[in-house]
């Protein structure tokens, strides 16, 4: 079985999917579409690398700039380097800029819906 | 303003190879993904694959998978679609379209590829 | 593969009259999240390259006459000339860009009776 048939038998099990089980599904090959990912938990999909979500979406990554506006993928641009955004080839902008410092203080992320970023 | 210049028609013989290119310029090469539709002689559209100009990451219709390889020189902002192991089926026209985010926005004016004996 | 079912085939209609392109996906094209739609339109004259009309089922791509609207949701879509003029002659395309391989339908021909 291949990944994107494996995708399809797995897909409606998905939703409350943790953070681990995406990450090694990204390994898998699956090339999830857009549809299914903005469907995963935001908690789940935040803490995902530019690198995982190309792996998890496959060609599917493309979209991203098309729903840049609508969570998660919104909140998960938002936690990304810019410079790992841009190799994506999408012109997205709202990264971290190069230089800043992303400190994971927990209870004031929660209140700002953002990360707490230290200047260079 | 966005453009899209494709390299000209070719005539090649069943198991050769052919090697489209697409020139690009009015935007960001790297900021676009750029994709290949071919359309055989009075029939539909058939989507190839997409690559991503700025890692060079590319995807492929499994229908082409083992005989398509699209790459990109971000020097020259110019795609290329190459095509092996050519058949008389493979006569078509191939297009480079410029993404828009997922959809088609910007479209070449077309390559013809002739396959025959 | 996603497959898109166009109707019909050709289409004759009068100047100033109403075209109506109907076009079917194999399975749903909305992303119930954002309620995007993801399904594009495009025109192809004879002799030119396709031209993107409609993206998202019902988004009017910048420069399109405010003729050309499209609608429609999840499985069914529609694309409607309000008053068709003689430089819309052409082949009308609907593509799902939903999941890969991105797929096209067969295209509607319109022609003025």
């Known amino acids: 079985m291949n990944g994107s048939e494996y995708f399809v038998k797995i897909q409606s099990f998905l939703g409350g999917a943790p953070t681990e089980d995406l990450k090694a599904l990204s390994q898998q090959n699956v090339s999830m579409d857009l549809a299914t990912f903005m469907k995963l938990r935001t908690d789940a999909v935040l803490p995902l690398t530019v690198a995982e979500v190309q792996k998890l979406l496959g060609p599917h990554v493309e979209g991203l700039k098309a729903e840049e506006r609508h969570r998660p993928v919104r909140d998960w641009i938002l936690r990304q380097r810019q410079d790992d955004l841009d190799t994506l080839g999408l012109g997205l902008q709202g990264g971290i800029p190069n230089g800043y410092l992303v400190l994971d203080l927990s209870m004031q992320e929660a209140l700002s819906g953002t990360p707490c970023l230290l200047g260079p | 303003e966005v453009q899209l210049v494709q390299s000209g028609a070719e005539v090649k013989k069943p198991g050769a190879s052919v090697k489209v290119s697409c020139k690009a310029s009015g935007y960001t090469f790297t900021n676009y993904w750029m994709h290949w539709v071919r359309q055989a002689p009075g029939q539909g559209l058939e989507w190839m694959g997409n690559?991503?100009?700025?890692?060079?990451?590319?995807y492929y219709n499994e229908r082409f998978m083992s005989r398509v390889t699209m790459t990109v020189d971000k020097s020259t902002s110019t795609a290329y679609m190459e095509l092996s192991s050519l058949r008389s089926e493979d006569t078509a026209v191939y297009y480079c379209a410029r993404s828009g985010g997922l959809w088609l926005a910007f479209w070449g004016p077309g390559t013809l590829v002739t396959v025959s004996s | 593969d996603i497959v898109m079912t166009q109707s019909p085939d050709s289409l004759a209609v009068s100047l100033g009259e109403r075209a109506t392109i109907n076009c079917k996906s194999s399975?749903?094209?909305?992303?119930?999240?954002?309620?995007?739609?993801?399904l594009a339109w495009y025109q192809q004259k004879p002799g030119q390259s396709p031209k993107l009309l409609i993206y998202?089922?019902?988004t009017r791509e910048s420069g399109v006459p405010d003729r050309f609207s499209g609608s429609g949701s999840g499985t069914d879509f529609t694309l409607t000339i309000s008053s068709l003029q003689a430089e819309d002659v052409a082949v009308y395309y609907c593509q799902q860009h939903y999941r890969t391989p991105y797929t096209f339908g067969g295209g509607t021909k319109v022609e003025i009776k």
């Open positions: 690559i991503n100009p700025s890692s060079g990451d590319s």
């Open positions: 998202f089922a019902s």
């Open positions: 399975q749903t094209l909305l992303n119930s999240v954002s309620q995007n739609n993801y």
